[in-house]
């Protein structure tokens, strides 16, 4: 859960498990399963299988989320699980559509106040640590549906009610229309569509492409911000280096982002964030001597 993320000492500079945006198609191999005299065949995919105890995890997360967020107390977690399950169970896992997730999306409808949406790209853990502190700002994973699925993998198989715990399609090696990728594309699109006011995005200044057109942010969210509702996008470029004082807002990929956003009639601002690890370390250990004295 988010508390576990906050408890982690280290800040990891990576995208996280749910950004699958290259579109390669392939076919997995078949392996026999079942112990009867007639072998049953299960597709062998290139990706890791469904996270163990997936149904229990989703249900438990739903219960915890609705306890902590009073505005979602009306949500029936059993119905949420049924809708989640219905999106991928008995379906060929390379042929999942956004339509499959609509019943779940409907149940998980939630609004973020204007100016309080935080998008992120390739810097998931720090974005989550930040929204733990700044409680009234929200990443997708602070919303019910994102919270349920964060860091999980799932898939089923055609014509059986079973969950596949052995393997699931890899978006690069197998197919892009798999249950996990389609889920994140669906909820990311919706999250961006409903944003209003000034929207913030946290970007990883340690990457060669600070803004990457192939990330979920670059390929889905940027294009689904609504100019009639969103006045501006403010990018926070997070510096990783201790002595890094460069102005990364001048980076060519940031200029590219500015161009895309400006063409969509949304204003663009950029801010360098130096030493965010310092702030978050002091959240974690307020008595640390470096937090009580000068730099």
């Amino acid at each position: 859960g988010l508390n576990d993320i906050f408890e982690a000492q280290k800040i990891e500079w990576h995208e996280g498990s749910h950004h699958h945006h290259h579109h390669h198609h392939g076919s997995g191999s078949l392996v026999p399963r079942g112990s009867g005299s007639l072998p049953r065949w299960r597709q062998q995919w290139s990706g890791s299988g469904t996270t163990s105890r997936f149904p229990e995890t989703v249900l438990a997360r739903c219960v915890k989320y609705t306890e902590v967020h009073p505005e979602m107390r009306h949500v029936d977690c059993q119905s949420v699980w049924d809708a989640f399950k219905g999106a991928f169970i008995s379906k060929y896992p390379c042929n999942i559509t956004e339509e499959d997730y609509q019943p779940l999306v409907k149940l998980g409808t939630q609004t973020v106040p204007c100016n309080k949406t935080l998008l992120w790209s390739r810097i998931k853990d720090l974005a989550h640590q930040f929204t733990q502190v700044q409680r009234d700002m929200f990443t997708l994973e602070d919303m019910l549906l994102g919270y349920l699925a964060d860091d999980l993998t799932w898939c089923g198989e055609f014509n059986t009610f079973e969950i596949n715990y052995q393997s699931c399609p890899d978006w690069r090696k197998d197919c892009s229309n798999n249950p996990v990728s389609v889920f994140w594309k669906t909820v990311s699109r919706r999250f961006a569509e409903t944003a209003c006011g000034v929207v913030h995005v946290m970007l990883n200044g340690s990457r060669s492409k600070i803004f990457d057109k192939n990330s979920t942010f670059g390929s889905v969210e940027v294009h689904n911000l609504q100019p009639e509702k969103v006045q501006a996008l403010e990018a926070w470029v997070i510096h990783g280096g201790r002595e890094d004082s460069r102005d990364l807002c001048q980076d060519p990929t940031i200029k590219e982002l500015e161009s895309i956003i400006s063409k969509r009639n949304i204003r663009f601002f950029c801010k360098n964030i130096y030493r965010p690890d310092k702030f978050l370390q002091c959240v974690k250990n307020p008595e640390d001597s470096s937090c009580l004295s000068g730099i």
């Epitope: 508390n3 906050f6 409680r135 310092k278 702030f279 002091c282 959240v283 307020p286 004295s293």
Partner: antibody, heavy 125, light 107 residues
Amino acid sequence: QVQLVQSGAEVKKPGSSVKVSCKASGGNFISYSISWVRQAPGKRLEWMGWIIPIFGTTTYVQKFQGRVTITADESTSTAYMELSSLRSEDTAVYYCARVKYGSGSYYPNNWFDPWGQGTLVTVSS
Amino acid sequence: EIVLTQSPATLSASPGERATLSCRASQSISSNLAWYQQKPGQAPRLLIQDSSTRATGIPARFSGSGSGTEFTLTISSLQSEDFAVYYCQQSDNWPLTFGGGTKVDIK
């Protein structure tokens, strides 16, 4: 040790604005958040909002939304609280305080330590 | 908004006595509560955080306990410098809110 020193007392007319400053010393300004809390005569302490200077993000309590603006100047390690459209009920001592985080059950807890010495704002015609 | 109710409003006691102050929350706030001391003309000072953890430099005679909706601040043996107003504050839910205070005065 972190010390917060606030600007002096102010007397203001109803309808006007007041801007109180809070200068931090002895600590790393970008490594913490600053909150503003007020205490009106005979009333309980009231949290108004906060700022996280390194990100520039603010939170305002709904009661003060639209009337309060909290800002910070990293170069001088100073936080500011401006309250507009003043009325007599805004007569109070205004405190700034560093936010100290604790281990919460879901979110990190927000405590106040240390506090500035307070600034008395009197609103009177 | 979570409402914190402190009792008694005033507690009259003598130096050396034990003082027990109560803070009740309008809904469960787990252990997300702090206690502050305020003397006349001064800013509040953090005494206890996370329900029972003493802040840096706070004497051992101050202790906090409780979780859910019922919390207690105990001063085991009152010293002359302990006569002041005490406030509780919750951090479970935004907005952060304070209790109305308990004044501890000399009997």
